[in-house]
C-alpha cells in the first residue's frame, strides 16, 4: 500500500549504550522524509525528528523518563516536499520497531579504571561511576545510581611479568586485592548485570598497569 514515491522504513534497530538511545533504520531516503513516533505500551505517541532526511533519531530524552518501561517506536515515510501526502489507505506508510526496555537492554559502556592505590601488599582499584543521561530531581544519575546492586564489576589482574590472570568481583565500584610485594600488576575491569538475559557484559576497560600515572604507591 502507499504512494509509489515513498517506501516504508525497514531494519528498525535500537542502538543504546548507558541509556544513550538512538533508533536507526533503512533506507537512505530518496525523495522522501521520515518522522519518528515513540510511546510506552500504555502511553500516547510522541513525535520526534520531524520530516528528517536522517536515518536515525535520538530518543534518549524520551526513554530516560522511565528506563524500566517498555517502548515501541514507529517510523513514518512521507514524500519530500509534500508531507501531507498519505498512502492509499489515507495514512502515511510506517514501520514498527521491536520493543525496547532500556533497563534490560541498553548496552553497558566500556568502563574506566579511575584509580589504583597500593598500600603494602594490597591494591585498591576504583572503577569510574559513569554518568548517564537519566535524571532525578534535575541531577544526572550514575550507572550505579540507576542499576544499584544489579550491576557488578569484574576485575582481571595479572603480574606484568606473566600472563596468568586472576579475577575478583564487587557489588560496589571498588576492589581491594592482595598482591606480591615488589611486583607490578596490570588491571582491566568489566561491567556485568548477571540477572540479564541479553547484553549482560560490557567490553573490557583499557588496561592500566602499576608504574603508570594513574596509580599511587604507599608503603
Amino acid at each position: 500500500s502507499g504512494t509509489t514515491n515513498t517506501v516504508a522504513a525497514y531494519n528498525l534497530t535500537w542502538k543504546s549504550t548507558n541509556f544513550k538511545t538512538i533508533l536507526e533504520w533503512e533506507p537512505k531516503p530518496v525523495n522522501q522524509v521520515y518522522t519518528v513516533q515513540i510511546s510506552t505500551k500504555s502511553g500516547d505517541w510522541k513525535s520526534k525528528c520531524f520530516y528528517t532526511t536522517d536515518t536515525e533519531c535520538d530518543l534518549t530524552d524520551e526513554i530516560v523518563k522511565d528506563v524500566k518501561q517498555t517502548y515501541l517506536a514507529r517510523v513514518f515515510s512521507y514524500p519530500a516536499g509534500n508531507v501531507e501526502s498519505t498512502g492509499s489507505a489515507g495514512e502515511p506508510l510506517y514501520e514498527n520497531s521491536p520493543e525496547f526496555t532500556p533497563y534490560l537492554e541498553t548496552n553497558l559502556g566500556q568502563p574506566t579504571i579511575q584509580s589504583f592505590e597500593q598500600v603494602g601488599t594490597k591494591v585498591n582499584v576504583t572503577v569510574e561511576d559513569e554518568r548517564t543521561l537519566v535524571r532525578k530531581n534535575g541531577t544526572f544519575l550514575s550507572l550505579r545510581d540507576v542499576f544499584g546492586k544489579d550491576l557488578i564489576y569484574t576485575l582481571y589482574y595479572w603480574k606484568s611479568s606473566s600472563s596468568g590472570k586472576k579475577t575478583a568481583k564487587t557489588n560496589t565500584n571498588e576492589f581491594l586485592i592482595d598482591v606480591d610485594k615488589g611486583e607490578n600488576y596490570c588491571f582491566s575491569v568489566q561491567a556485568v548485570i548477571p540477572s540479564r538475559t541479553v547484553n549482560r557484559k560490557s567490553t573490557d576497560s583499557p588496561v592500566e598497569c602499576m608504574g603508570q600515572e594513574k596509580g599511587e604507591f604507599r608503603e
Partner: antibody
Amino acid sequence: QVQLQESGPGLVKPSQTLSLTCTVSGGSISSGQYWSWIRQHPGKGLEWIGEIYYSGSTRYNPSLKSRVTISVDTSKNQFSLKLSSVTAADTAVYYCARDAPYYYGGGYYYYMDVWGKGTTVTVSS
Amino acid sequence: EIVLTQSPGTLSLSPGERATLSCRASESVDSSYLAWYQQKPGQAPRLLIYGASTRQTGIPDRFSGSGSGTDFTLTISRLEPEDFAVYYCQQAGVVPYTFGGGTKVEIK
C-alpha cells in the same frame, strides 16, 4: 552509630494499604548503603520484601512486587514501605534494615548489618 | 527462587557443647552472598557471619562459618548461655533474597 526506627499504624483493615516509615539516625541515607524491608510472620521465618538505594533504584521480592512500593526521602533521612490490598496473611513483624558493603574476596558485598527493632502490624477488620 | 533448607529444625544442647548447623541451597550460591544471622525472642536478627566464613565485628571467635556451593555450615565451638537462639542463613545474590527456615538452638 546508625540506628533505625520503624513507625506506622499497628492495625490495618483488609484490602487497605499498609504504610510504614523507617527513620535513619546517626548517619546519612545517601551514604552508599541500601535500605531494606523484611517481615516475619508470627512464629515463622524471615521474608525479604525489597530494598532501595538513595537514588530511588529498587529491587522487590517478585511474590510481592505487584503490591509493594518502597520509596526514599533523602531530605528527611527516611525510607518507606507501602503494601496494598492487604489480607490477614500480611500480619507480621516488619523490620527495616541497612544493607552495607563489607569486604570479601577482593571485592565488596552488601549485608544487612543494622536492623530496626521491628513493628507489629495486624491486618484485621 | 533459591530455597535454603536448614537442619536440624531444633538442636538441644548443653552449655559448653559444640553446635553444628547446616544450610543447604536448592542451587549453587556464591559464597560472597551467604550470611548467617542470630535472632533472640522479641529482638531483631543480628548479623554474625558474611561471605560464608567472615565474622562480623564484635562476634566472638567461637562462631565460625564454612562451606561453598550448596552446602554451608555454622559452627559454635562451645555454647555459651547467650548463644541459645534461632539462627538463619541467608543468600543475597539472587532476587528474591531468601532466608532459611531457621535452626533453634535450645538448652537441653
